[in-house]
């Protein structure tokens, strides 16, 4: 099967989410850590991560088929201090599997606003910190 | 366990300078901007100057830039405050403080370095 | 730059007593943060977020509010709550802005 990861971002309000979701099967869950950065280009690792999630096998889903596992990274107010090129990474201690995600960023802007760019999934989000609107 | 170490206030002449310095330890110090906040004795708290985690960019209170430098050296866990002429209105107990990375809290502060400016 | 404008500046309370501090802000802010001070010793965050206790906080204390007006609450005064609290935004571009403190004594 394919494991892949992906990165994502969504706002409620003032806040800004961000996503790393990896798609595995379900019994490779097991010893999976998936971790996010900033700005570190060479050394990102679960000990150097901003935040970081052990993955676990849930005896609860059923089947064989694909499943995805997230970590969710929540800034409740996006400030200068953010801006910042991030990664999502994941590993897995039992088969030395290693996921890098595509770098994205965090720009603040000087009129107070922010944008997030580098997603896949979608490629350019520009968020108004005032309004908190998604354009 | 996270700890914060200011070092290098003390009694300062008005027109000097001074460089205050805190030292990390505890938790990755590279990952995580960094502030310092002044308390005038008797007085409130106020914000003085944050610096980013990597070091690059710098942000100050208005009634301070042109005087004040923050920096900092992540090979070391060590932050710094460069304060040149030096005024009375700045004595005042200095806290490093680090930012909350999900918040717009300051979640630790260290025990404050006292600056004292008198002649 | 906006300004945090607490109130009261210095107040007393007996054991058991619910108190409520408020802080006002001159334009509306998206969150209040606040903090307790003792003599001698650093700023601790109390409440962050309006109404998240900071770790080891006791549940008699509570915050609340929103725009303009933001609040922190001890439901059962206690001696130790005797402390000066500060209240904290943060808004572009004026960065991060504290309120002048409240001094609570206990009577």
């Known amino acids: 099967g394919c494991i892949n990861i992906t990165s994502s971002a969504s706002q409620e309000g003032t806040r800004l989410n961000l996503i790393c979701t990896v798609w595995h099967k379900k019994e490779e869950a097991e010893g999976f850590v998936v971790f996010l950065c900033k700005d570190r280009s060479g050394d990102c690792s679960p000990e150097t991560s901003l935040k970081q999630l052990r993955l676990k096998r849930d005896p609860g889903i059923d089947g064989v088929g694909e499943i995805s596992s997230q970590l969710m990274f929540t800034i409740s107010q996006v400030t200068p201090l953010h801006s910042g090129t991030y990664q999502c990474c994941a590993r897995s201690q039992k088969s030395g599997i290693r996921l890098q995600g595509h770098f994205f960023s965090i720009l603040f802007t000087e009129t107070g606003n922010y944008t997030v760019t580098g997603l896949k999934q979608r490629q350019h989000l520009e968020f108004s910190h005032n309004e908190g609107t998604l354009s | 366990e996270v700890k914060l170490v200011e070092s290098g206030g003390g009694l300062v002449q008005p027109g000097r300078s001074l460089k205050l310095s805190c030292a990390a330890s505890g938790f990755i110090f590279s990952n995580y901007a960094m502030a310092w906040v002044r308390q005038a004795p008797t007085k409130g708290l106020e914000w003085v100057a944050s610096?980013?985690?990597?070091?690059?960019?710098?942000y100050y209170r208005d009634s301070v830039k042109g005087r004040f430098t923050i920096s900092r050296d992540n090979a070391k866990n060590t932050q710094y405050l460069h304060i040149d002429s030096l005024r009375s209105e700045d004595t005042a107990t200095y806290y490093c403080?680090?930012?909350?990375?999900?918040?717009?809290?300051?979640?630790?502060w260290g025990q404050g370095a006292m600056v004292t400016v008198s002649s | 730059e906006i300004v945090l404008t607490q109130s009261p500046t210095t107040m007393t309370a007996s054991p058991g007593e619910k108190v409520t501090i408020t802080c006002r802000a001159s334009s509306s802010v998206s969150y209040m943060h606040w903090y307790q001070q003792k003599p001698g010793a650093s700023p601790k965050p109390w409440i962050y977020e309006t109404s998240k206790l900071a770790s080891g906080v006791p549940d008699r204390f509570s915050g609340s509010g929103s725009g303009t007006s933001y609040s922190l609450t001890i439901n059962n005064m206690e001696a130790e709550d005797a402390a000066t609290y500060y209240c904290?935004?943060?808004?572009?571009?004026?960065?991060?802005?504290f309120g002048a403190g409240t001094k609570l004594e206990l009577k």
């Open positions: 610096v980013n985690s990597g070091g690059a960019n710098t």
């Open positions: 904290q935004q943060w808004n572009y571009p004026s960065m991060y802005t």
């Open positions: 403080a680090t930012h909350n990375y999900e918040s717009t809290v300051f979640d630790y």
